[in-house]
Each structure stands twice: as C-alpha cells, then as structure tokens.
C-alpha cells in the first residue's frame, strides 16, 4: 500500500479535512515539473516565476536574464524560442488552439544584440508553425499551408511551397488524422543536424471525405466546421516527403524522397523522419494494413541532387500476431557511425526490447531482455545508452531510468533511479543536455513529484529543480485516500489494478465501487503516479472505492496481452473489467448493489459495453465522448487494431462491436451519456447514434451535451461536467448531498 503523503499522527486527525470537489475544480493540489530547456551541454533556459527568461550555466553556477518579463509583456508573449546562435529570440503570442497539438500564433523576433524587435520583413500572421534551424538563425515557418524560409530574421522570406490550400494541401504541417494518430505533433518538417537541408511532408487531402458539424457561437446562424477526416475504410491522405537545400533554396527546389517499392504498391502512411547526418536521412513508412513497417535510410547524391534510398538500406519490421509496434512504430536512435541504430521492437518472446541493428533486422543484437518492456530510448552517446523500462520489482506501471555502458564489453546495466527516492519516486522521465553531459529527472510519483538535476557522467544529484514544497504543505491537513497497486491472476491473464480507498477504509465494511476505465490498445491506467483528481475526491469525501484495471489490450506487459484485442475491439477489454469487478466483490468490502463504471473516449466505449453486458453487475455508469461504432472513428487508429470494414476483411466485427447493437441491454442500468457537440476527434455522431438507438428501443437514459466543446470538455464545461457526474453517482449510490 502506498500512503500519499506520509501520514500525520492520529492526534492531529481532527484538524484534517477531506478533499472537496471545489479543490479539484480549482486545481488547488496541482503539481509542477521542471524540464530544462537545454541549449548546450551545460546550459539551459527556464522561465522564472516572474516570467523572465533566465539562462543557467551548471558548471559556473551563474545565471542571468536573457529576456526580461517587460519585453515578454510588451507583445503579450506566452512562449519563446532562442536561436542556436543566441542572437535572436522568437516571442509567441495570440495563441489560438486548433486540434490536439496544433495552434496558430503571432511571432515577433527580438534581436538580443541590440535589444530591439526586428523591423522590416516582419512575419505574417497567424503562423501555423515556426522553428529555428539547429545551427545559426535561419527560420522555417508555415503560413496558410505553405512553407517559407528566412536566411536571417530580417531577410525577406523565400517561399518553398506554393500549392498549400486550406483543407486540401498541407505542407510542413499535418492534416487532422496525421496530427492525431500518426505524428502526434503540430509540425511535419525537420531540419538536418546542421541546417543544410529541410525535409517536409506534403499531405494531399483532396479526396478525403469531410466531417461537418455546427459550431453555434453567438451569431444568428451557426458556422459549419469542415475537416477532412478519413473514417475507417475511407480514402486516406496522400503523403509525399520532400527535401530542400536551404543554402540555395530557389535553385534545385524540393526533391522528393522515394517511397520503398514494397510500401508504394498499396495504400501507405509515412510515420516519421529522423535525420542521421546532413546528408543522410531515415524515413519510416507503414502499410495501410499496419502490420508491416519499413525503415528506409537515404543518402544525398550531389551529382543528381537527389536522395537515394537503396534497397540494402531498407529494414522491414513485421508483426504476425498484431500490428507493427506499440501505439506507434518506434523510432530509431542512431549511433555515432551514422548507419547503425538502436530501436525498440518485439523480441522472440513477445516483449518490446532494445535491439541494435548494424546491417539487417534479422541480425539485430538484442540489448535488453526479460519479461518486462523497454519503453523509451532517451539518448545514445559514445559510451552509454539511457532508456526507461518497467523492469524494477516487476511492476509494469513503474518507469525507471537505466544506463547501459555500450563502450565496454560485455555491456553493463545500471538503474539510475531505482533507489533514489524509492517510496516517493517510482515513475520517472528524463531530459538530457547535449552529449548527455547533464540530465534532469522528473519523478511523477507515487509521492509528490520532484524534479532533480544530475551529472551525466557520475549520475550524482546536483540540485533539486522543483520539489513542490507548497503542495506538500497544502496537503498536510488533507485526508488523502490510500492507494494500492496489486494484481489478479485469472485464467493465465495478469490483471493489474489500482485501488483508491477512502482514508478511513475498513475492510469489514461495504463500500460503493466505481470503476474508472480507459482500456484502449497500448494504453496503461495502472501507473505509480501522483494525482489529486476527481476520483481522489470521490474516495476522500464520498467514501467510494475506485478501481482502475489494465486488461487485455493494454501495454508494457508483452505482446500476448497487447495483441489479444487485435481485430476484435470491444470484447476482451470489457470482459476483463467485469472479471476484475467479480474479484473485487470476492474481497468482501464492496457493496455489490452499488457498483458503477465510467470512462472517457475509448473508456466511454468500454463503460457503455460493460453496462450493456447483461451481467447485472453495474447499477449505473457514465460514458463521456464515447466511440459507439468503429466505423465512425479515424482510419489510422481504427484500422491499426481492427483491419478494414469490408466484407472480405473485418466488417462483421465492426458491426458486432457497436454500442447501438446492445441498446436493449441498457434497460436495467442508469446510463449517463455525455458529449461535446464540437468534438473533432470522437464526433458527436457517436453519441447521437447511441441516443437514437436507445430511443428506438424505448430505453430511458440521461444525457448531457456541451455546446461548442471538443473532446476535452475544457473551461467552465469541466466544472459543470464533474459536478453533474458527481450528482449522478451520488444519486446512484444513494449518498446524501
């Protein structure tokens, strides 16, 4: 059992109070992390509490303000970026969110040498993406779906692409589906290491069907939002990758990088680009049927000004039991010879591990092994490889940072974080300076998060960057729930769960149980992280037991569990939640007449199917922004796990796995269905179809829509949402207001 934070003596318990919903909605107990903005091996930038941009030198111990809050405020800047030659800073203001990662903004360039904003040839507005070259102070930016280049901030721009068109052709930025489901970035352009070349993707959405929904706003007539959005089986974007020489950009023009023949023979995706050197680039491609991925290493041929991708430099990754990779296909981390690389993929036992590829994937040397998984490769230096895994003490929901010495033979492995603050910190990420001279560790829990700075050679802690002292003090008089992470063994399946228990939990009593579920492929809910959130409040104040269960389809426990759901979403994820509930009832402290389930997005789908499972286990449940049919969701995501909705592929299961098909089964449960009308991701259509099916089946249910809100239901909607759900659950569990 993990107690968070360390408990005070009973004599002080009368001064303690439970969490309130207001605490949660106000973010009273939110924590801070500290990620240095590294600008060299030993220097980083950080925005101070009073909004000055400060440069810290670890070795001299000195710090100085490079940009004052006054300058920031003069243009209402909310973000900044220093040019690598340290002569200029871009200041970002007028932030306007688009989708999950994308936003537009206004950019101003500040000249540090003369303390003035650059005048003349100012940047247009709003800009969709802007970045400095890795060396010097060239600027690449995307405006109105076209890419522009400036050799210096004050120079006139050079237009690289000319065919950009809203909702049709996207240059240097992804379209909706690539942003959300493939790249997970707002950009689709990549500078070569020394800024000689600029690679970019062009997405052609001309033939993609459009999702249209009303945005009500304040006007007399609602606006219609149109997004090219390929649903399962629909026409997909056509992607091409180009590279342009930025030294003399006008002359040769963008040169297209060829697609491997085995990929180009049918529908395909581009999945990522990694520069190796200024004249070597690595592209990753994926067949539309996402079980074959090809990594292609391409070289610049000066005579022909082209990029050559020989077949001998194509590496194929194929899955025979599921889809390629985890959530995404992993990306390579190249070693200093600029041809061999390290990459995470499944070993022969079906666990994701680090492999070293020198010539062919078949001859890959396995670097890590065991019945656990390597999660991320942070950095490869001449003599060390830093990675994270969930190996330590066999808890899949932990993350520790390891160092493997690759300079010595045999390589030796050291856990950098396992014993640092063992009770407080079991879930880490890291951020490395150039050449891994120094690194920051960010611990997310289970105790109060803490960020620390370390020497990259000795791993010694240099200083604490952020320890959340204020949060620690604020929590001293709060009765936080107890948390435990344990596992159930059922029919050769291990179901890890996290249980959040009321502060005065007594095993001899009966408690209402709320299952919080996500359950999407390659997700993980049971993690050793700190959180004071809505479910913490439900346990602390309302006396509920909350459980999160990682069933089949979830990540980091091997391919058997992960790929179990392949081509049959909506079956085992639901079964495993139900199995876990039955086991929880057997524990003796659950009131089996008061069990609820709730989830958001994929979790809304699973909670809906669980409620409609006909088991009689659940009294009530909530689905927020649920998927209701896989035919309604994005092609890239859906087809990865379900194949195509065609007769000769997997149409039958697409049809069988809808929420609507189970409308009759909602008759004996209390169902609350919630959705934002401007959800660009899981379209309101999903809930509209559930509601229609329930009405047609004459099944009573409750519903709430949030006008003009997207998949995140943010702002005031958040407060309304959690208040509404709290009332619903308290009513369901017969808890007094």
């Amino acid at each position: 059992i993990v107690l968070r934070p360390s408990r005070v003596h009973n004599s002080e318990e009368n001064t303690m109070r439970a969490l309130t919903l207001k605490d949660i909605l106000n973010g009273t107990f939110s924590y801070k992390t500290f990620f240095p903005n590294w600008i060299s091996g030993q220097e980083y930038l950080h925005q101070s509490a009073d909004n000055n941009i400060v440069l810290y030198n670890i070795e001299t111990g000195q710090s100085y303000t490079i940009l004052s809050n006054r300058t920031m405020k003069s243009v209402n800047a909310s973000n900044y970026g220093l040019s690598p030659d340290r002569q200029f800073v871009y200041l970002e203001s007028d932030y306007s969110k688009l989708w999950r990662y994308s936003y537009t903004a206004t950019y101003y360039i500040y000249d540090l040498s003369n303390g003035e904003f650059v005048r003349g040839n100012e940047l247009p507005r709003p800009i969709q993406y802007l970045c400095w070259s890795p060396v010097g102070s060239k600027l690449a930016y995307v405006y109105q779906n076209n890419i522009y280049l400036k050799q210096r901030p004050g120079d006139p721009p050079f237009q690289i692409t000319f065919n950009g068109r809203e909702n049709k052709i996207f240059n240097g930025i992804p379209d909706w589906v690539y942003e959300e489901e493939m790249l997970a970035t707002k950009y689709a352009l990549w500078w070569s290491p020394n800024g000689k070349f600029l690679a970019y993707a062009e997405f052609n959405d001309t033939d993609i069907p459009v999702i249209a929904y009303s945005y009500y706003g304040d006007e007399q007539y609602p606006r219609t939002i149109n997004i090219p959005y390929p649903k399962a089986g629909a026409k997909n974007p056509v992607v091409r990758i180009f590279i342009i020489d930025t030294t003399y950009p006008a002359y040769v023009g963008p040169q297209e990088v060829p697609v491997p023949a085995m990929i180009a023979s049918s529908d395909y995706y581009f999945s990522w680009l990694t520069w190796v050197t200024d004249e070597r680039v690595c592209l990753q491609w994926l067949k539309r049927v996402q079980n074959v991925s090809v990594l292609s290493i391409c070289d610049f041929r000066e005579d022909w000004q082209t990029w050559d991708c020989p077949k001998t430099q194509e590496h194929i990754e194929e899955s025979r039991t599921g889809w390629a990779g985890g959530f995404f296909v992993s990306t390579p981390v190249f070693s200093y010879d600029a041809i061999s690389y390290y990459k995470i993929f499944s070993d022969k036992d079906g666990y994701k591990h680090i492999h070293y590829i020198k010539d062919t994937v078949e001859n890959a040397i396995q670097i890590t092994s065991g019945k656990w998984e390597a999660i991320n490769i942070f950095r490869v230096t001449q003599d060390s490889l830093f990675y994270s895994s969930n190996e330590f003490e066999e808890y899949p929901g932990r993350r520790n940072i390891y160092r493997i010495s690759i300079g010595s033979y045999p390589p030796s492995k050291k856990c950098v974080t396992c014993h640092l603050r063992k009770e407080r910190c079991q879930y880490y990420t890291a951020s490395f300076s150039d050449y891994a001279k120094y690194y920051a560790l960010v611990c997310y829990g289970p105790g109060i998060p803490i960020s620390t700075l370390h020497d990259g050679r000795t791993d010694q802690e240099i200083k604490i960057l952020e320890e959340n002292k204020e949060l620690e003090n604020a929590l001293k008089n709060i009765q936080l729930p107890k948390e435990e992470i344990k596992k159930l063994e059922v029919d050769e399946i291990t179901l890890w769960y996290k249980m959040i228990l009321p502060p005065q939990f007594d095993r001899s009593k009966k408690y209402p149980l709320l299952i919080q579920v996500y359950g999407g492929p390659c997700s993980q809910s049971v993690r050793s992280v700190f959180a004071v959130n809505w479910i913490s409040y439900l346990a602390s104040k309302e006396g509920m037991v909350i459980a999160l269960v990682d069933g089949r389809g979830t990540a980091f426990q091997g391919d058997k569990l992960l790929y179990a759901v392949y081509r049959k979403l909506g079956v085992y994820e639901v079964e495993d939640q139900i199995t876990a509930v039955r086991k929880f009832i057997e524990m003796g402290f659950i009131d089996e007449k008061r069990i609820a389930i709730w989830g958001w997005s994929y979790g809304g789908y699973v909670s809906s199917l669980a409620l409609a499972s006909g088991t009689g286990l659940f009294k009530c449940g909530i689905a927020v922004a649920p998927v209701s049919s896989w035919e309604y969701y994005a092609s890239v995501y859906t087809e990865r796990f379900m194949g195509l909705p065609t007769k000769d592929d997997n149409l039958e299961h697409y049809k069988n796995s809808t929420v609507m098909a189970r409308a009759e089964y909602f008759r004996n449960v209390d169902y609350l269905l919630i959705h934002g009308t401007a959800d660009d991701n899981v379209h309101f259509q999903n809930s509209a179809q559930i509601a229609k099916a329930l009405v047609n089946a004459q099944v009573d249910f409750q519903a709430m829509w949030y006008s003009d809100q997207n998949h995140g239901l943010s702002g005031l909607s958040t407060n309304h949402l959690y208040t509404h759900m709290t009332h619903f659950l308290k009513q369901c569990f017969s808890l007094s207001d």
Epitope: F162, N163, Y248, A250, G253, E256, Q305
Partner: antibody, heavy 120, light 107 residues
Framework: QVQLQESGPGLVKPSETLSLTCTVS??????????WGWIRQPPGKGLEWIGS???????YHDPSLKNRVTMSVDTSKNQFSLRLSSVTAADTAVYYC????????????WGQGTTVTVSS | EIVLTQSPATLSLSPGERATLSCRAS??????LAWYQQKPGQAPRLLIY???NRATGIPARFSGSGSGTDFTLTISSLEPEDFAVYYC?????????FGQGTKVEIK
C-alpha cells in the same frame, strides 16, 4: 530592363576548351536574387540545360557534363562565364545564357544566343 | 532523369483556331513545369511557370494546366505571331530537362 549578352569564339577545335562569357546589364549579379544559367541548342534539335551559378560562386550543372563544365562569376564586371573542356562535334550548338529564378519561376530573361561550332 | 514527351510533334492550324499542346512526364513533376516559346533565330521566351502561371507580359490567350505527369498548354485563339516551337521544361527532379518541342505551323 535586364539584358544578357553572350560572347566568345564561334569556332573551337575538338579536344580544346570552349569559353563563353555572359555580360549582364540592368541587374546586378551580386544582388544575390538570381542564379545565372547556360542552355544550349544543337542544330535542329531541342534545348539542353548545362548549368547555373550563384553570385557566391556556388554551381549546379548537368551530371552528364560534370567533369567537363566549369562556371565562374565576376561580380566586379557583372559577368559570368562557362568553360567546357574536351569538346567534340556533339558540342556544336547555339549557347544561351539566361537569368534563372529557380525551380518555381524558371528562366525568365535570355540572351540572344551565340553559335559555337566545334570543328578542326 | 525525367523524360518529357511532347505531342504532337507538329500542329498545323489556322490563325484564330485553338491550339492544345501536350507534355507528358515519365514520372510526377508536381506542378514544377514551365512552357517556353521559340521563334526561328530567337532565344526562347518564358510563357508559363508552375504549370499554370503566366509570366510577365504574356497575353491571356496563353494558359497552362495540369499537375503530376500530364500538362497542357492552350492558346485559345492563335495570332500570327504565335506560330513557333514550344518547349516544356520540368524543374521537379534533377537535372532540369526539356521536352523535344512541338512546332505550331500555319495550315
């Protein structure tokens, strides 16, 4: 307006080096806004691109001619030059110089051309 | 390198008629295709860049279209001074290449 004028010998012996100069008026080569290119047209045939040079001296040329082509620029005289070594009869052509605005805008101003015959 | 094939080799038309010239690329050249006009004893003149944009001073009767591999130059109503050889040129792949030309002659 911008004008380009090619100059050089009209007759070159086989195996020797062909040398041509293009003088630019109405625009400055050193402004760095354009590339300056060479194109040729064998008798009764189509156009063949030879190569281009930037004010900085950076050059691009047809890979098939790579080892024989040398281009240079003299910003003080507002001229750029072409040297083609080891010529054969196949190099007989009208040689044009042009202002080259790159892959998008193309070659928008041309000289009137100069005929070079390779013959002994 | 990319091969540009122009058709027809010769087009015999009368003044006032519509001329349609074709240029086909051996692989996609996006829209980076230009058209030039060359009259006997003269240097080529740029007509169209980026497949469809008229160069400065070019009359509106000249128009270009197409993208990828198939491109067309259209002269809506031939004037006497339009009888010449027309070349297409691609700048998408290295090196830049020209088509073999289409001769538009008076019928």
């Amino acid at each position: 307006q911008v004008q380009l004028q090619e100059s050089g010998p009209g007759l070159v012996k086989p195996s020797e080096t062909l040398s041509l100069t293009c003088t630019v008026s109405g625009d400055s080569i050193s402004s760095g806004s354009y590339y300056w290119g060479w194109i040729r047209q064998p008798p009764g045939k189509g156009l063949e691109w030879i190569g281009s040079i930037y004010s900085s001296g950076s050059t691009y040329h047809d890979p098939s001619l790579k080892n024989r082509v040398t281009m240079s620029v003299d910003t003080s005289k507002n001229q750029f030059s072409l040297r083609l070594s080891s010529v054969t009869a196949a190099d007989t052509a009208v040689y044009y110089c042009a202002r080259d605005r790159g892959y998008y805008y193309n070659m928008d101003v041309w000289g009137q051309g100069t005929t070079v015959t390779v013959s002994s | 390198e990319i091969v540009l094939t122009q058709s027809p080799a010769t087009l015999s038309l009368s003044p006032g008629e519509r001329a349609t010239l074709s240029c086909r690329a051996s692989q996609s050249v996006s829209s980076y295709l230009a058209w030039y006009q060359q009259k006997p004893g003269q240097a080529p003149r740029l007509l169209i860049y980026d497949a469809s944009n008229r160069a400065t001073g070019i009359p509106a009767r000249f128009s270009g279209s197409g993208s990828g591999t198939d491109f067309t130059l259209t002269i809506s109503s031939l004037e006497p001074e339009d009888f010449a050889v027309y070349y297409c040129q691609q700048r998408s792949n290295w090196p830049p290449t020209f088509g073999q030309g289409t001769k538009v002659e008076i019928k």
